[in-house]
């Protein structure tokens, strides 16, 4: 799978994580920080 950094408009897309652009799937993906989950890393869990 080809990946690159997300475009600058997506800077705020991932609330607690890193935004990755999955080129072949035409979608943005959030790699969440430890303790966070959800499509956009918006949920905190213990």
């Amino acid at each position: 799978v080809s990946i690159t950094k997300c475009n600058s408009d997506m800077n705020g897309y991932c609330l607690h994580g890193q935004c990755i652009y999955l080129v072949d799937m035409s979608q943005n993906y959030c790699r969440c920080e430890v303790g966070y989950t959800g499509v956009r890393c918006e949920h905190f869990y213990l």
């Epitope: 475009n7 408009d9 652009y21 035409s26 979608q27 943005n28």
Partner: antibody, heavy 116, light 106 residues
Framework: QDQLVQSGAEVKKPGASVKVSCKAS????????IQWVRQAPGQGLEWMGR????????KYREKFEGRVTITADTSTNTAYMELSSLRSEDTAVYYC?????????WGQGTLVTVSS | DIQMTQSPSSLSASVGDRVTITCKAS??????IAWYQQKPGQAPRLLIQ???TLQPGVPSRFSGSGSGTDYTFTISSLQPEDIATYYC????????FGGGTKVEIK
């Protein structure tokens, strides 16, 4: 199956406002950005602005600043685009477009006619 | 706002011809360009995103290339069903469409 279903055609008088809705099904709009694009008859595509429904943050094209308002109701999974002070040049098909979780999934379009 | 200058605005070519459309951005858009096809009365159809990535179901005669500010869209062998208007879209910093290119058969 993911869908963006827009409200029906509207006829408005110059100076009035119009509010177009865009209801999402099959996905949560909080996971996406919702863009708005318009196309006047026989003309090209024009990006108007977008909303991040999760953060409730908006960005508008300079040309529309102060005249367009994009909102989202996450409880009903619906986005809205309101355009005020309508003029004849605003006659166009207005599209909502999902971006973020996938690349640019389009609604069916809403024709807004501005005529006296 | 980033400006996208698309050329030509229209072209006429024969079936089987190679067709090339260009888009120039007013600043580096880091390969974040997409190409759409639109037929009369229809919503735009995404053909290519991230400069050269073909969408599923799109024929391989369509291709894209470029980097920095200069991008190219090519139809290697024009078919009658390719008659449409084509638009580039930059999506690096917000969004801007090119003015469109109307492709007709000679």
């Amino acid at each position: 199956q993911d869908q963006l279903v827009q409200s029906g055609a509207e006829v408005k008088k110059p100076g009035a406002s119009v509010k177009v809705s865009c209801k999402a099904s099959g996905f949560n709009i909080k996971d996406t950005y919702i863009q708005w694009v318009r196309q006047a008859p026989g003309q090209g595509l024009e990006w108007m602005g977008r909303i991040d429904p999760l953060r409730r943050s908006t960005k508008y094209r300079e040309k529309f600043e102060g005249r367009v308002t994009i909102t989202a109701d996450t409880s009903t999974n619906t986005a809205y685009m309101e355009l005020s002070s309508l003029r004849s040049e605003d006659t166009a098909v207005y599209y909502c477009v999902r971006s973020g979780t996938s690349f640019d999934f389009w609604g069916q379009g809403t024709l807004v006619t501005v005529s006296s | 706002d980033i400006q996208m200058t698309q050329s030509p605005s229209s072209l006429s070519a024969s079936v089987g011809d190679r067709v090339t459309i260009t888009c120039k951005a007013s600043q580096d858009i880091h390969k974040y360009i997409a190409w759409y096809q639109q037929k009369p009365g229809q919503a735009p159809r995404l053909l290519i995103q991230y400069t050269s990535t073909l969408q599923p179901g799109v024929p391989s005669r369509f291709s894209g290339s470029g980097s920095g500010t200069d991008y190219t869209f090519t139809i290697s062998s024009l078919q009658p069903e390719d008659i449409a208007t084509y638009y580039c879209l930059q999506y690096d910093n917000l969004r801007t469409f090119g003015g469109g290119t109307k492709v007709e058969i000679k």
